[in-house]
Amino acid sequence: KLLQVSTIAMQQQEKLIQQERALLNFTEWKRSCALQMKYCQAFMQNSLSSAHNSSPCPNNWIQNRESCYYVSEIWSIWHTSQENCLKEGSTLLQIESKEEMDFITGSLRKIKGSYDYWVGLSQDGHSGRWLWQDGSSPSPGLLPAERSQSANQVCGYVKSNSLLSSNCSTWKYFICEKYALRSSV
């Protein structure tokens, strides 16, 4: 009889432990759900607010038609400038038309005055041809005005309203370009 009681007591004890575990799991699960809910709400909030505030260009970028431009506040050599633009999901500026050139030079005059700014133009060492970074050729009116007397690689830059060339290892400001976001409204 005593043995039977002690077996029942042990079973009850086991049941109690299992229930405690279940309660603990439930509490943990509830906490996890609450955290997930909080995360989801925050995520939704961010998405909604960014959708609400979505401007065609990021902060500190300038818009013109379908493009956004970033004028750097630091100097770097041409290759580092290229990487700095890539980090921002953009490429070095590629000037497609005289209108775009006029917009850029006009904006630079307002922002900084007469400094040198790397653009995505470089000269092929073998052929001497000027090419934009995507491999396309500049239009005839957008070729650098002077040939750099450099044995090193030569890259293009904008100064005042001219496109010029220089040794790619010199330090200059730079301009990045990306596409403007289309408004979904």
């Epitope: 980090k87 921002e88 999901g89 953009s90 970074q133 995507d134 370009e177 990306k178 596409y179």
Partner: nanobody, 115 residues
Framework: QVQLQESGGGLVQAGGSLRLSCAAS????????IGWYRQAPGKQRELVAA???????TYADSVKGRFTISRDNAKNTVYLQMDSLKSEDTAVYYC?????????WGQGTQVTVSS
């Protein structure tokens, strides 16, 4: 954390073609700029080509007109199509993910062009 894995390297004759792939696991690649770099023995690692999340492309002068970078967001993969290969293209090719806060690299794939 994003894991990048390159594939498609190998031995090819001068004038031949190869297509390298850079596949990602751990996160979607679609919001990142992805670049292909290469490093030949005794030389510095150099940028070969890159493609932004918007599809803007940039190429090194030495590969313009021969290499093409593209991306397939559905497959979470970026490709480098290499045509008219030259012996100077021999190197280990790496892909790199760019973001404003951090960069991440793959392990690399060897490309050997024999003349």
């Amino acid at each position: 954390q994003v894991q990048l894995q390159e594939s498609g390297g190998g031995l090819v004759q001068a004038g031949g073609s190869l297509r390298l792939s850079c596949a990602a696991s751990g996160r979607t690649l679609s919001s990142y700029t992805i670049g292909w770099y290469r490093q030949a023995p005794g030389k510095q690692r150099e940028l070969v080509a890159a493609i932004t999340n918007q599809g803007r492309r940039t190429y090194a002068d030495s590969v313009k007109g021969r290499f093409t970078i593209s991306r397939d967001n559905a497959k979470n993969t970026v490709y480098l199509q290499m045509d008219s290969l030259k012996s100077e293209d021999t190197a280990v090719y790496y892909c790199k993910g760019f973001s404003p806060t951090d960069d991440f690299w793959g392990q690399g794939t060897q490309v050997t062009v024999s003349s």
